[in-house]
């Protein structure tokens, strides 16, 4: 459509242009996780704040029960940061005890669930060994990329250890997606 | 407007479509920081290169005095990476000396200032304990997310210790934003 | 063009609006790297999966021979994550041997090649010292930012040590770009 002239003497069919402000978008922020039941053999999913503070959902992008619901097919940029904090990892104790030194680790996974698929799809994974010397450690894992999603897909964020997630501030741990 | 036909026999009101190339955008790159006065109880703000090398501002997105100025309300993707480098943190020394083992840390905050608000808003924070064994360490903290901003909002990047920022290369430490 | 009325009694010249679905986009995922010849004095470039699983290229964005080819001038968001994994770095051994304690490191660079330029341009760099206590370590480096690219530019991802790249899962190591 670049710089093209349209004579008004006949009808025009327009390409699917759309106002950017109408696109599905969400930015979710951390809330404290309360002990709950998780699916067996799957990292626990985080739940999120979706309307207070910096958090929002708009243009039919809805948040419900730990999931972001994709309202429209297209290419989405999806991102999350999870800040973890913990005490000295058991790594050094394991090493001292002369057992094999398997490091502790922290992992974040952004997962897509499609109702017609039996298995969730892991879209993004950030995983890091933690073998800290100090007694208290903290660090973020950031992820972000573009994916082709279908209307009805659901997105969630799973973590390896839910009790190490820093829930104190909305700028430390968050999850978002927007249609490109 | 998807695939809709427009008969030329009457006036049309168009949705707020706009050329993507007209949207406010900026990518700023690191410069050597000169010692300046900082606000009390606030991490120091970095200043940036805005026109040389890879850096640019366009479409009324201006950079002035450590701030990116938001020229138009809307949803923006904001990102920054800060690469830190330092000598061994005092962490191990503190521990050996028997003092409380509070780890050193490095922190990046992307902050929004709105003139009508008394307090800045922390949009994004990346914070990491540093308890390195090696004598020289270096590592990046990356942040990025989407926020609803208002015309006139100002964005800055604050760091916990300005003297640890690696200012040597424009690809190591940077700050950007673009209207979605 | 916001909310503006267009009378059909004369021809209109339209700004370069374009359907978002038509924009060049790619998300590439990791494959096992086969030993190849690398350019002297340059980190080796990764090669990628471009059509299986989560990977795709669309709208004239092509992948060939380790490069993403930019088909159209404009501002692109470019991102990559590389997950590294290795055994204990030699850092501690070096220190014990009384030699200067230069830490091991891992580095990712997103590089632009323009045929008319003799030298590649480093757009983004993530670099991290590795001085891990544990015998096995793993960690990601994430990068992402916006750049003005020209038609014909080529993008690649270079790493400091190709043998440390975790090629096991498409969600751990990836590379993408999209026109804004």
């Amino acid at each position: 459509l670049k710089g093209q002239e349209f004579a008004p003497s006949h009808q025009q069919v327009y390409a699917p242009l759309r106002a950017d402000g109408d696109k599905p978008r969400a930015h979710l922020t951390v809330v404290r996780q309360t002990p709950t039941q998780h699916f067996k053999n799957q990292f626990p999913a985080l739940h999120w704040e979706h309307e207070l503070g910096l958090a929002f959902t708009k243009n039919r992008m809805n948040y419900t029960n730990k999931f972001l619901l994709i309202p429209e097919s297209g290419d989405y940029f999806i991102y999350s940061q999870v800040t973890f904090r913990g005490m000295t990892s058991e790594c050094s104790e394991i090493r001292q005890a002369g057992r094999p030194n398997k490091p502790d680790s922290i992992t974040v996974v952004i997962t897509k669930v499609t109702d017609s698929y039996p298995e969730p799809t892991q879209l993004l994974m950030g995983t890091k060994s933690v073998c800290e010397v100090g007694s208290n450690w903290f660090q973020p894992i950031y992820l972000g990329a573009m994916f082709s999603l279908q209307e009805g897909d659901k997105l969630m964020v799973n973590v390896s250890d839910i009790s190490l997630v820093d829930y104190t501030k909305e700028d430390k741990t968050f999850f978002g997606a927007f249609l490109l | 407007l998807k695939g809709q036909e427009f008969a030329p026999s009457h006036q049309q009101v168009y949705a707020p479509l706009r050329a993507d190339g007209d949207k406010p955008r900026a990518h700023l790159t690191v410069v050597r920081q000169t010692p300046t006065q900082h606000f009390k109880n606030q991490f120091p703000a970095l200043h940036w290169e805005h026109e040389l090398g890879l850096a640019f501002t366009k479409n009324r997105m201006n950079y002035t005095n450590k701030f990116l100025l938001i020229p138009e309300s809307g949803d923006y993707f904001i990102y920054s990476q800060v690469t830190f480098r330092g000598m061994t943190s005092e962490c191990s020394e503190i521990r050996q000396a028997g003092r409380p083992n509070k780890p050193d840390s490095i922190t990046v905050v992307i902050t929004k200032v709105t003139d009508s608000y008394p307090e800045p808003t922390q949009l994004l924070m990346g914070t990491k304990s540093v308890c390195e064994v090696g004598s020289n360490w270096f590592q990046p903290i990356y942040l990025g997310a989407m926020f609803s901003l208002q015309e006139g909002d100002k964005l800055m990047v604050n760091v916990s210790d300005i003297s640890l920022v690696d200012y040597t290369k424009e690809d190591k430490t940077f700050f950007g934003a673009f209207l979605l | 063009l916001k909310g503006q009325e267009f009378a059909p009694s004369h021809q209109q010249v339209y700004a370069p609006l374009r359907a978002d679905g038509d924009k060049p986009r790619a998300h590439l995922t990791v494959v096992r790297q086969t030993p190849t010849q690398h350019f002297k004095n340059q980190f080796p470039a990764l090669h990628w999966e471009h059509e299986l699983g989560l990977a795709f290229t669309k709208n004239r964005m092509n992948y060939t021979n380790k490069f993403l080819l930019i088909p159209e001038s404009g501002d692109y968001f470019i991102y990559s994550q590389v997950t590294f994994r290795g055994m204990t770095s030699e850092c501690s051994e070096i220190r014990q041997a009384g030699r200067p304690n230069k830490p091991d490191s891992i580095t990712v660079v997103i590089t632009k090649v323009t045929d008319s330029y003799p030298e590649p341009t480093q757009l983004l760099m993530g670099t991290k010292s590795v001085c891990e206590v544990g015998s096995n370590w793993f960690q990601p480096i994430y990068l992402g930012a916006m750049f003005s690219l020209q038609e014909g530019d080529k993008l690649m991802v270079n790493v400091s040590d190709i043998s440390l790249v975790d090629y096991t899962k498409e969600d751990k190591t990836f590379f993408g770009a999209f026109l804004l």
């Epitope: 002990p35 709950t36 208290n136 009790s163 829930y167 104190t168 | 509070k102 | -």
Partner: antibody
Framework: QVQLVQSEAEVKKPGASVKVSCKAS????????IHWVRQAPGQGLEWMGW????????NYAQKFQDRVTMTGDTSISTAYMELRRLRSDDTAVYYC???????????WGQGTMVTVSS | DIQMTQSPSSLSASVGDRVTITCRAS??????LNWYQQKPGKAPKFLIY???RLQSGVPSRFSGSGSGTDFTLTISSLQPEDFATYYC?????????FGPGTKVDIK
């Protein structure tokens, strides 16, 4: 709903050991740390330590380091706290608690009174 | 170890009163500060986390503030069921420590 049910009250002689149990239900036992906190009669709360039921990892307050052992049995979603070489000043109500994060205590057991008396 | 102090150690108040309890840490604990309520013969109940964020199900008359070393728990309008002992607890570093408690009783 989430519940922690503790074992019954115990009376012990000085020098003996006590093992208090804490049965969890209503949540995934391995996903959250279990803490032990005690409260002497008329006194405040004192944190003793935690166990990560998933890894078996523990963190004890220095004061109890050489006398306490915290364990877990994931097959029956139960945590245990054993305190050895009991003294009269160990007389207290012992609580187990679970936190949505490892640094706080969302849900508490009903408490187990341990009396140490000769 | 991080020491936690509370003031006052006890206070008498009437239904409808605004009550403020302060808690101080011996070193900075950022916002890793939690508040609990305990009634006689009962286990403590979790009220506030992260210094200022209300635990699910806790009435909005409870609020918390502070960061670093100084923190406050406020009950905006005291209700009959609020007469209890209140404890602060730091979750910044091990060993986790509690304040000595503040007893709120009927005037």
């Amino acid at each position: 709903q989430v519940q922690l049910v503790q074992s019954e009250a115990e009376v012990k002689k000085p020098g003996a050991s006590v093992k208090v149990s804490c049965k969890a239900s209503g949540y995934t036992f391995t996903a959250y740390y279990i803490h032990w906190v005690r409260q002497a009669p008329g006194q405040g709360l004192e944190w003793m330590g935690w166990i990560n039921p998933n890894s078996g990892g523990t963190n004890y307050a220095q004061k109890f380091q050489d006398r306490v052992t915290m364990t877990g049995d994931t097959s029956i979603s139960t945590a245990y706290m054993e305190l050895r070489r009991l003294r009269s000043d160990d007389t207290a109500v012992y609580y187990c608690a679970v936190g949505g994060s490892y640094d706080a205590f969302d849900i508490w057991g009903q408490g187990t009174m341990v009396t140490v008396s000769s | 170890d991080i020491q936690m102090t509370q003031s006052p150690s006890s206070l008498s108040a009437s239904v409808g009163d605004r009550v403020t309890i302060t808690c101080r840490a011996s070193q900075s604990i950022s916002s890793y500060l939690n508040w609990y309520q305990q009634k006689p013969g009962k286990a403590p109940k979790f009220l506030i986390y992260g210094a200022s964020r209300l635990q699910s199900g806790v009435p909005s008359r409870f609020s918390g503030s502070g960061s670093g070393t100084d923190f406050t728990l406020t009950i905006s309008s005291l209700q009959p069921e609020d007469f209890a002992t209140y404890y602060c607890q730091q979750g910044y570093s091990s060993p986790f420590t509690f304040g000595p408690g503040t007893k709120v009783d009927i005037k």
